[in-house]
Interface confidence: medium
């Protein structure tokens, strides 16, 4: 039985050229997190954090994606094309798979505030 819930940073905004942290947190379960996959809106994999084998950043994103903090992901040198949905998928044992959603809006405005809050999607 899957008892856990994924908390995410929800809807966030950041300015073009800046950076943003994508964070998910799995709670309310004793399941062991084996792997976290980070996907972009078009379902392409950005990165994988395997509990045993470590981080793997996919080649297309190597220059703009940094692992962490924790199981999260830092996107750098943001462009307008980065606007969209991001998904964290937690593969756990024995529960199975949990999935969280974050919506990132990249703003042209230099006064764009980086806003982030944890919420349950």
């Amino acid at each position: 039985m899957m008892t856990g819930t994924i908390e995410t940073t929800g809807n966030i905004s950041a300015k073009k050229g800046g950076s943003v942290i994508l964070q998910c947190h799995l709670s309310s379960t004793m399941a062991q997190v084996t792997q976290v996959n980070w996907e972009q809106h078009d379902h392409s994999l950005l990165a994988i954090r395997n509990a045993e084998l470590g981080w793997h950043i996919y080649p297309a994103f190597k220059d703009r994606v940094a692992p962490g903090p924790g199981l999260g992901l830092t996107l750098q040198s943001l462009t307008m094309n980065d606007t969209g949905e991001y998904f964290c998928t937690y593969h756990t044992y024995p529960d199975g798979t949990y999935r969280g959603r974050i919506f990132l809006e990249v703003l042209e405005s230099s006064v764009a505030e980086h806003s982030a809050r944890f919420q349950i999607p």
Epitope: T34, N37, E39, N50, L53
Partner: antibody, heavy 127, light 107 residues
């Protein structure tokens, strides 16, 4: 820190039996698949057997089927290999290896790699 | 059974040189291939998993590539501690199999 310590190796005559043990520590033993891998003197690696987390599924290389039995005791954090009808060609260092799981989202399946190994125990089958 | 053939059997190189090791599978293993390093008297060490991903703590000079039946392990610039035997292993299906190994020795 993950630790795997094999024991039970030694000299045995052809046709004899031996039981190898692997004591695991530093991780939740019941959450991981385990394998035995062997290496004959001066030769390459050969996977021998695999057992799932709860012991429900077991796999063997053809050359040991019907002679070797892999088992585990999750309460004791231990893995075993019962070896019967031993042959000269079973002479090798036997390693206990723990699986690390990788999820391939493009194919929706888990892959199992051996990231943690013991230091091995030598089994010599000779008359 | 999937047979893995490694070549060359022995590679004689000097420190600082580039090493290219090959592993060929008798049938497709997709990307389910690992590379291990083994030194005399020691257990194998996982270097690469899923054909191209470096395991935790493995230096960037080690890289893997390929999919299907043809795979390559590249060591961009050999360090003295890299001289060892390297094995590929497929985890696509049982029985799991290893290649025969490639020994990288000092020239």
């Amino acid at each position: 820190e993950v630790q795997l310590v094999e024991s039970g190796g030694g000299l045995v005559q052809p046709g004899g039996s031996l039981r190898l043990s692997c004591a695991a520590s530093g991780f939740t033993f019941s959450s991981y698949g385990m394998s035995w891998v062997r290496q004959a003197p001066g030769k390459g690696l050969e996977w021998v057997a695999n057992i799932k987390q709860d012991g429900s599924e077991k796999y063997y290389v053809d050359s040991v089927k019907g002679r070797f039995t892999i088992s585990r005791d999750n309460a004791k954090n231990s893995l075993y290999l019962q070896m019967n009808s031993l042959r000269a060609e079973d002479t090798a260092v036997y390693y206990c290896a723990r699986v690390s799981y990788y999820y391939d989202s493009s194919k929706l399946r888990w892959a199992e790699y051996f990231q943690h190994w013991g230091q091995g125990t030598l089994v010599t089958v000779s008359s | 059974e999937i047979v893995l053939t490694q070549s060359p059997a022995t590679l004689s190189l000097s420190p600082g040189e580039r090493a290219t090791l090959s592993c060929r599978a008798s049938q497709s293993v997709s990307s389910y291939l690992a590379w291990y390093q083994q030194k005399p008297g020691q257990a194998p060490r996982l270097l690469i998993y899923d054909a191209s991903k470096r395991a935790t703590g493995i230096p960037a000079r080690f890289s893997g590539s390929g999919s299907g039946t043809d795979f390559t392990l590249t060591i961009s610039s050999l360090e003295p501690e890299d001289f060892a035997v390297y094995y590929c292993q497929q985890v696509h299906n049982f029985p799991l199999t290893f290649g025969g190994g490639t020994k990288v020795e000092i020239k």
